[in-house]
Interface confidence: low
Amino acid sequence: FKVATPYSLYVCPEGQNVTLTCRLLGPVDKGHDVTFYKTWYRSSRGEVQTCSERRPIRNLTFQDLHLHHGGHQAANTSHDLAQRHGLESASDHHGNFSITMRNLTLLDSGLYCCLVVEIRHHHSEHRVHGAMELQVQTGKDAPSNCVVYPSSSQDSENITAA
């Protein structure tokens, strides 16, 4: 399977909410002992590999923001912890999963990574990630709402299989 990022760049005004999205593509094993661990974290564009560094989002680690379920099942973080930080991650039946960030500030600007780990017998079996940029703007040049820029299908940094 692979992870696709429908949008590679989100440009938002300060104070707005944004939902960053990834999509799980390809065949998903629905075996009785296969689950998927989906999560989000901040990173930087490393020289070797994007998303190799895992940094917290608003002080919440990738472990705080995880979703854990089988295949294309719906799930969302109900943690008070995440919601207190204006964050919520969710997943639907179609392989889409997202993180919503409320009341954006300039400090939220940066590279965001979604990560899916296929787990069999509690071992990490297969790992894929996607990357996208969030730019939070302020002042007269800022858009009135979030503007999203589609990923090019040739952009290998946005569809990564491990």
Epitope: D33, T35, Y37, T61, Q63, D64, H66, H68, H69, G70, V117, I119, R120, H121, H122, H123, S124, E125, H126, R127
Partner: antibody, heavy 121, light 112 residues
Amino acid sequence: EVQLVESGGDLVKPGGSLKLSCAASGFTFSSYGMSWVRQTPDKRLEWVATISIGGSYTYYPDSVKGRFTISRDNAKNTLYLQLSSLKSEDTALYYCARHSSIYDGYYGAYWGQGTLVTVSA
Amino acid sequence: DVLMTQTPLSLPVSLGDQASISCRSSQSIVHSNGNTYLEWYLQKPGQSPKLLIYKVSNRFSGVPDRFSGSGSGTDFTLKISRVAAEDLAVYYCFQGSHVPYTFGGGTKLEIK
């Protein structure tokens, strides 16, 4: 700081039952696989049970399968081990252990101090 | 079941010397995902086991670099380059690749 505190160990007669608990703190409990490991009086270590992050999948050696049940309550940050049809060879110090994050896939990253189960007539 | 055989049972060493403990599995412990879940633990009297090495050769956080792990397939080794007084303990290998997961019988490191 990661803390695992086991409780529930006791002296029990052969054929009896017991429920062990492991209270976890200092980490996001629902993000980690957990295991029970026991240490026999002759100091041998024996893996007893493992449970996956969400609690859907459990694994046991044949020596305890059907007699022991591992479970977890992620809302209470607690791991359990239900022991039944106990035998004298189940006498041991029972440890709960937290796995690493799933990305590294190792087992006893952190252990509790153990709770003693003695099976004797 | 995978049998883990540790040698020697007891290892007398002088402080500052190198110590080497062997662990042999009865079959390959390479998991189907390509990883080898071979771990080494240390246990001091009255304490719970502590993780030293995971996945054959990776030192766990806080473990001094005098501890190193190596090996592949069925043969694995733990080396302590300069034995310190606090290293005197029982060492166990463990395989987490195949259910049932199994430990070695232990090696006691003691002063010569």
